[in-house]
């Protein structure tokens, strides 16, 4: 009898007739940048401070009428989504709000822009414990607010934003497209992505995952004891938001990128009907629906790793494209792909101080995506080691000579256009597990590191006849770091990671005969650590 | 209109005793850009967000602010510095006309300028 | 059919407690598409809400009472009690206990008071 | 808060004839208005909610009208057993009550 988007973000040991999961936020505070608010209405009395920032611009129309309850429906529906009471995710969190969106919803940049510079200057003025700001809006792709929530986000606040209500990449819209925010898109009962009317939730990579954002019950401005149900991707971000506020509650030391590792972690994998998405945004798209942690304490040990798509490179000869991980973060591996299967690898390379995944596009091709396995690694020490084409039958092959260094991820580049379409493919010898091996006109790449109980294993999954996709899976307790094919033939459009599985892909194949040439092999690197694992033994 | 014509009365009193000789002196090195929202309806032409380098201080940004008012002043143009951005951007929010703009992106400390835009409640 | 019935000292002296219990029968109180209720009632005046609570310990206060009043529930028991401190003559009337529907889950009908429980009074007198 | 005014405090009437009360309140309640009806010795009992919906089991000679600040409730043919107190209750802002209107025997 519980609402159902409450229920869906409860884990199962949590499902008694009501939801009451431990510690309600009560640690964190949550900025509000919406609508006025109805602060007096029950579900949300006393826990949310109106702040006296407000900076909005004119409402449209001469015969325009100013009504309260209209005026706060936004915010207070929001507010009540993120702390009520009795319909709210983090009961205990407390709020402050600040008007950036008129009476018809709407703001201006630069009124977001200030309100930010608000929230950085209260920080500073009065530190509290953690804060998360919720910006349940969107305009156009802005370089300045991703600028300002940029720097915000570095200094230790959490931002999480609304992916959108245009159905369309998240990626045209800020600050949606602000890779330091935590961007959200909506799901209904189903575990589907959101129609709203015409339009619905926005998708593709710069969306970091989904949230129940259809048919929300939450605080309705038209009475103080009134609900009402909204939908969108603002309900969407306040449920993560509400979460956020949970793990900062219960853990108040993570950083961004470790609440976001999190986050990650614990949604629910691959609920969400793909189809509704574009067909070229669908590898893109993170199959995620958030969740709470099962248990709040006790996920220190593990190794986690996320999934970082590039921007698209662009169809010319030269063009590449690169994935970034956060500041916090290392980047374990690096592969790409290509719709066209036209190009010529990707590479680990330095850039300001850190690793960066740079895909490289071939000449004919459409494009290629860059995609980064970016990992958390606590005292980690990683280095790439290359080794240029080799001219050998044999192939090329690289491995992590370094004492103490486990190999992570394998990438290989190459300079020709068309690699392997008439060359044998080569095939890792076996037993040596800490070393890549590629075509032997391609230059190999080798992710290596060290890291206080790091250890890794080499997984493969070949299959003789050609097929669309080959997957490989990491078992329970490791974590997939590093996703590559063997042999990199031409007809492999590229591998990537999906969770804590490795797909590569392969042209569609009744283009491809059935010779040695179409097989294909999905090689993962699967790592754990067992410093981490005792570590939080020590703790417990 | 009439409080136009005060906060030009005002802005003219303070140029006077405004060091002005600078003014049209143009920093060295990178341009400046330009960006305004690809979506059409949802542009706000007329308010303009000039971000300044990143260890720009504040008192830099006012002077910035100051400088491009009085150079706008001199071509005929009336400008409004509605705020100065410190804490998370250094830089200023400005009320002015387009055509001021390859003038402001020649300004000292520039980084960018962005056209305002709309967002809106999702 | 859901019962509401009131219990709890008839007489209680300036300066002490009250403490009522509402025992609900015929539904359960944990379920989140109510809230539960006290109003009162002095002697030929008006009603008076003094407050409500939701089955998850969520409690909800009159503004001029709030300090005076503390709404608990035992979901265990299918009860709901009311205590309300330092008490003076004025705070002699018939108390209420009542089930509001809390729109939390809008199927579960008007955001009202109803059904009531038959009211006990209580005299505050030394 | 909210202060509901009822009139008249009294009303003296006739079975079968029509009663009409008033409640006003002292600020917009939109259409969060509800009339209960309590009889000696009784417990109050909803009648109308949101302004103009009738109660379960409550007979359609009970009506409800009004929105904002101004709301009636009408008795279109008094039955014996409707003189009682009505009372008006709004939840626009929490919860508080009218006076009452005391409906007797002519």
């Known amino acids: 009898s519980i609402p159902w988007n409450l229920e869906r973000i409860t884990p199962p040991r949590y499902r008694a007739d009501e939801y009451q999961p431990p510690d309600g936020g009560s640690l964190v505070e949550v900025y509000l940048l919406d609508t006025s608010i109805q602060s007096d209405h029950r579900e949300i009395e006393g826990r949310v401070m109106v702040t006296d920032f407000e900076n909005v611009p004119e409402e449209d129309g001469t015969r325009f009428h100013r009504q309260a309850s209209k005026c706060d429906s936004h915010g207070t529906h929001l507010a009540g989504v993120v702390s009520g009471r009795d319909a709210g995710v983090a009961k205990g969190a407390s709020m402050r709000s600040l008007r950036v969106l008129n009476c018809q919803g709407k703001g201006t940049v630069s009124g977001t822009l200030i309100g930010l510079e608000f929230i950085r200057k209260s920080q500073l003025v009065q530190p509290v414990g953690p804060l998360v700001v919720l910006l349940p809006l969107a305009g156009g792709y802005s370089r300045v607010l991703n600028a300002a929530c940029q720097r915000l986000a570095r200094a230790g606040v959490v931002l999480v934003t609304a992916a959108g209500n245009f159905r369309d990449d998240a990626c045209l819209y800020s600050p949606a497209s602000a890779p330091e925010v935590i961007t959200v898109g909506a799901t209904n009962a189903q575990d589907q992505p959101v129609t709203l009317g015409t339009l619905g939730t926005n998708f593709g990579r710069c969306v970091d995952l989904f949230a129940p954002g259809e048919d929300i019950i939450g605080a309705s401005s038209d009475c103080s004891t009134c609900f009402v149900s909204q939908s969108g991707t603002s309900q969407a971000a306040a449920h993560v938001a509400g979460i956020a506020a949970m793990m900062l509650s219960a853990e108040p030391e993570l950083t961004l990128a470790e609440l976001r590792q999190r986050l990650i972690h614990f949604s629910a994998k691959d609920v969400i009907n793909e189809a509704w998405f574009p067909e070229d945004q669908r590898v893109l798209t993170p199959n995620l629906v958030a969740a709470l942690p099962p248990s709040t304490h006790g996920a220190g040990w593990q190794l986690f790793c996320r999934t970082v798509w590039s921007a698209h490179s662009g169809p010319t000869r030269m063009a590449t494209a690169v994935a970034r991980c956060a500041p916090d973060e290392e980047l374990l591996s690096c592969s790409s792909f290509s719709r066209s299967g036209k190009r010529r690898g990707e590479r680990m390379e330095a850039q300001g101080g850190k690793l960066v995944c740079r895909a490289h596009n071939a000449f004919g091709g459409e494009g290629v995506y860059a995609i980064a396995r970016c990992c958390l690694l606590p005292q980690a020490n990683c280095s790439v080691h290359t080794a240029p084409p080799a001219e050998a039958s044999m192939g090329t092959r690289v491995h992590c000579h370094q004492q103490g260094h486990v190999l992570t991820g394998c990438s290989s580049h190459w300079e020709v256009e068309d690699l392997g379409t008439h060359k044998p493919p080569v095939l890792r010898p076996r037993g040596q597990p800490n070393q890549c091996v590629g075509h032997r006109e391609a230059s190999i790449h080798a992710s290596c590191c060290h890291a206080p109980g790091l250890e890794c294993k080499v997984k493969e999954h070949g299959i003789p006849a050609p097929q669309e996709q080959v997957t490989v899976a990491c078992e329970e307790g490791w974590t997939l770091t590093g996703c590559s094919a063997l042999p990199g033939t031409s007809h492999v459009l590229g591998a990537y990671a999906v969770d804590n599985t490795c797909v590569v892909r392969s042209r569609d194949v009744s283009t491809t005969g059935s010779t040695s040439e179409g097989a294909v092999t999905a090689v993962a690197i699967c790592c754990r650590s067992r410093h981490l694992a005792q570590a939080s033994q020590e703790l417990q | 209109q009439e409080d136009e014509d005060g906060d030009y009365e005002e802005l003219v009193l303070a140029l006077r005793s405004e060091e002005d000789g600078l003014a049209e002196a143009p920093e060295h090195g990178t341009t400046a850009t330009f960006h305004r929202c690809a979506k059409d309806p949802w542009r706000l032409p007329g308010t303009y967000v000039v971000v300044l380098k990143e260890e720009t201080h504040l008192s830099q940004s006012e002077r910035t602010a100051r400088r491009l008012q009085a150079q706008a002043a001199r071509r005929g143009y009336l400008t409004k510095i509605l705020h100065v951005f410190h804490g998370l951007l250094p830089g200023f929010l400005v009320k002015m006309s387009g055509d001021l703009l390859e003038l402001a992106l020649k300004l000292p400390h520039v980084d960018y300028i962005e056209e305002d835009s709309s967002v809106f409640a999702q | 059919q859901l019962q509401l019935q009131e219990s709890g000292p008839g007489l209680v002296k300036p300066s002490e407690t009250l403490s009522l219990t509402c025992t609900v029968s015929g539904g359960s109180i944990s379920s989140s598409s109510y809230y539960w209720g006290w109003i009162r009632q002095p002697p030929g005046k008006g009603l008076e809400w003094i407050g409500s609570i939701y089955y998850s310990g969520s409690t909800y206060y009159n503004p001029s009472l709030k300090s005076r009043v503390t709404i608990s529930v035992d979901t265990s028991k299918n009860q709901f009690s009311l205590k309300l401190s330092s008490v003076t003559a004025a705070d002699t009337a018939v108390y209420y206990c009542?089930?509001?529907?809390?729109?939390?889950?809008?199927?579960?009908?008007?955001?009202?008071?109803?059904?009531w429980g038959q009211g006990t009074l209580v005299t505050v007198s030394s | 808060e909210i202060v509901l005014t009822q009139s008249p405090a009294t009303l003296s009437l006739s079975p079968g004839e029509r009663a009409t009360l008033s409640c006003r309140a002292s600020q917009s309640v939109s259409s969060y208005l509800a009339w209960y009806q309590q009889k000696p010795g009784q417990a109050p009992r909803l009648l109308i909610y949101d302004a103009s919906n009738r109660a379960t089991g409550i007979p359609a000679r009970f009506s409800g009208s009004g929105s904002g600040t101004d709301f009636t409730l009408t008795i279109s043919s008094l039955e014996p057993e409707d003189f009682a107190v009505y009372y008006c209750q709004q939840r626009r802002n929490w919860f508080t009550f009218g006076g009452g209107t005391k409906v007797e025997i002519k």
């Open positions: 009542a089930r509001e529907g809390s729109g939390v889950v809008p199927a579960a009908g008007p955001n009202w008071f109803d059904p």
